[in-house]
């Protein structure tokens, strides 16, 4: 703001008074400017924090979107499965021998539920099993498969403790472990295991076992397998047969080293691995450098981490 120029000479007192007023005014303006500058600095800082938060939010959102995208693949078909499962539950009796009982995805298949997706298995008081949400594969090799493990997005850590592996974790439409207690219950009848794998070049392979049993917790969820068939090269689960389950906090392996800590997962570690299907999910570029990845020795060796894996079970006597 410019100082006013007087054409006529003013009286000295008036001049001094005007001067003082102008100085005051200038001081006030400087104070205002300082305040404004301080406010601007604060705003800039707030904006910067906000931008950082937004970037973090965007990163988080993109991860969420990636998860949603992978889920979306099966969403449409799953909507069909939401046809009131209460009808299904009402039809079920609590007797173990009942032909109407729903134990797993094969039971659902026999009741003409032929769409792959998420179903709720009703509780069974006789077997002492709670209600359980499962993902059913109703298409592969005749269908009726209950998926017990899936690795496809890498958004879920599998370096978990004994309790988490016992109860299960992850997202039923994404990456998950169904839970050792549930898998043990599901394998109490003669059961078949199928392991499906995909590498980073898009090749698909499978391994099937004529017999699959998971012992109870007292037996440390020990793995028992029957004969192998498949196209994945060497059988990389046989080495883990008759081996107890180990996690980072429960060392049940046959090794002086703690395999669960070395291989970063929960698994039937021997000393240590021919396969490590619950290992670390490594993305393309990092997928062939690590011993603790999702490995299957008989196919790509001990340092190649696979892109996708699913483990699924169904009764041995299942007929499509």
């Amino acid at each position: 703001q410019k100082l006013s120029k007087h054409k006529t000479p003013a009286q000295p007192q008036l001049k001094a008074a005007n001067c003082c007023e102008e100085v005051k005014e200038l001081k006030a303006q400087v104070a205002n400017l300082s305040s404004l500058l301080s406010e601007l600095n604060k705003k800039q800082e707030r904006d910067w924090v906000s931008v950082v938060m937004q970037v973090m939010e965007l990163e988080s959102n993109s991860k969420r979107m990636e998860s949603r995208l992978t889920d979306a693949e099966s969403k449409y078909s799953e909507m069909n499965n939401q046809i009131d499962i209460m009808q299904l539950q009402a039809a079920q009796t609590v007797t173990q021998t009942s032909a109407d009982a729903i134990y797993d995805c094969s039971s659902l298949y026999q009741k003409n539920y032929r769409i792959s997706g998420v179903y709720k298995l009703p509780p069974d008081d006789f077997l002492g099993s709670p209600e359980l949400e499962v993902f059913c594969d109703m298409e592969t090799s005749g269908g009726g498969w209950t998926i017990i493990q899936r690795r496809k997005s890498g958004l879920v850590s599998f370096y978990r403790d004994w309790k988490q592996y016992k109860q299960g974790f992850g997202s039923i439409r994404g990456d998950f472990w169904l839970g050792n207690e549930h898998i043990h219950r599901l394998s109490r009848q003669p059961t078949r295991l199928r392991v499906e794998m995909e590498d980073w070049e898009g090749n698909l392979r499978y391994a099937e076992y004529s017999h699959f049993v998971l012992g109870n917790e007292l037996n440390s969820y020990r793995l028992f397998l029957g004969n192998y068939t498949g196209n994945v090269g060497n059988d990389a689960l046989q080495y883990h047969n008759n081996t107890a389950f180990s996690t980072k906090d429960k060392d049940n392996d046959n090794c002086l080293d703690k395999c669960a800590q070395l291989r970063k997962g929960g698994y039937w570690y021997n000393c240590c691995t021919d396969s490590n299907l619950n290992g670390v999910y490594y993305r393309l570029g990092e997928h062939n450098k690590h011993l603790d990845g999702i490995t299957w020795y008989g196919w790509h060796g001990s340092t190649y981490s696979l892109k996708r894996v699913e483990m699924k079970i169904r009764p041995e006597d299942f007929k499509p």
């Epitope: 080495y239 046959n254 002086l256 080293d257 000393c271 240590c272 691995t273 020795y297």
Partner: antibody
């Protein structure tokens, strides 16, 4: 040069206790698992116990389980075998051994590559 | 526990002979087998590990083979210093176990 020297052997009465030590030198002690093996007079070798490098994992032969305790002090480069409730059949030369590890296709292979000269334990009344 | 059975329990041989010692496991142990040599009053010495890998410093006349349940230690041309007792040992699972030993003495 890698060296293992056992000590602490001697004559002890049945039911008594003894603590064997094994002083290690010439290698990074904490990086290796260690083991105890014994040999009764005129008999073959019998594995007794093993311990991981950190001391977190220990294993025992059924014949000594509950009576013997393997431990290590990595700051002193020393392996120990605490032997309680000793029996006549525990009479033997006790060897300590360094356990080497090799990895093939994701499997770890263990073997005892360096042995001490042994210390004699006699359990007799 | 895995039992290890060696045969023969003793063998008489001459310098220059080819000597073969076998070791059988009561169940499959993959390649988790080591061979040791022991001379009277001395500590055992590692010869072979992982069924067929020769330990550093061990003469090449010693060789190991086998996998699963049946294993062999071969001395291609016996030398005077080779007269000793030989033990196989499995490290497939705990407890680790030794064979009962095979004594190689002079014919």
């Amino acid at each position: 040069e890698v060296q293992l020297v056992e000590s602490g052997g001697g004559l002890v009465q049945p039911g008594g206790s003894l603590r064997l030590s094994c002083a290690a030198s010439g290698f990074t002690f904490s990086s290796y698992a260690m083991s105890w093996v014994r040999q009764a007079p005129g008999k073959g070798l019998e594995w007794v116990s093993a311990i991981s490098g950190s001391g977190g994992s220990t294993y025992y032969a059924d014949s000594v389980k509950g009576r013997f305790t393997i431990s290590r002090d990595n700051s002193k480069n020393t392996l120990y075998l605490q032997m309680n409730s000793l029996r006549a059949e525990d009479t033997a030369v006790y060897y300590c051994a360094k356990v080497e590890r090799d990895m093939v296709r994701g499997h770890y292979y263990y073997y005892m590559d360096v042995w001490g000269k042994g210390t004699t334990v006699t359990v007799s009344s | 526990d895995i039992q290890m059975t060696q045969s023969p329990s003793s063998v008489s041989a001459s310098v220059g002979d080819r000597v073969t010692i076998t070791c059988r496991a009561s169940q499959g142990i993959s390649s988790w087998l080591a061979w040791y040599q022991q001379k009277p009053g001395k500590a055992p010495k590692l010869l072979i590990y992982a069924a067929s890998s020769l330990q550093s410093g061990v003469p090449s006349r010693f060789s190991g083979s086998g996998s699963g349940t049946d294993f062999t230690l071969t001395i291609s041309s016996l030398q005077p210093e080779d007269f000793a007792t030989y033990y196989c040992q499995q490290a497939n699972s705990f407890p680790w176990t030794f064979g009962q030993g095979t004594k190689v003495d002079i014919k």
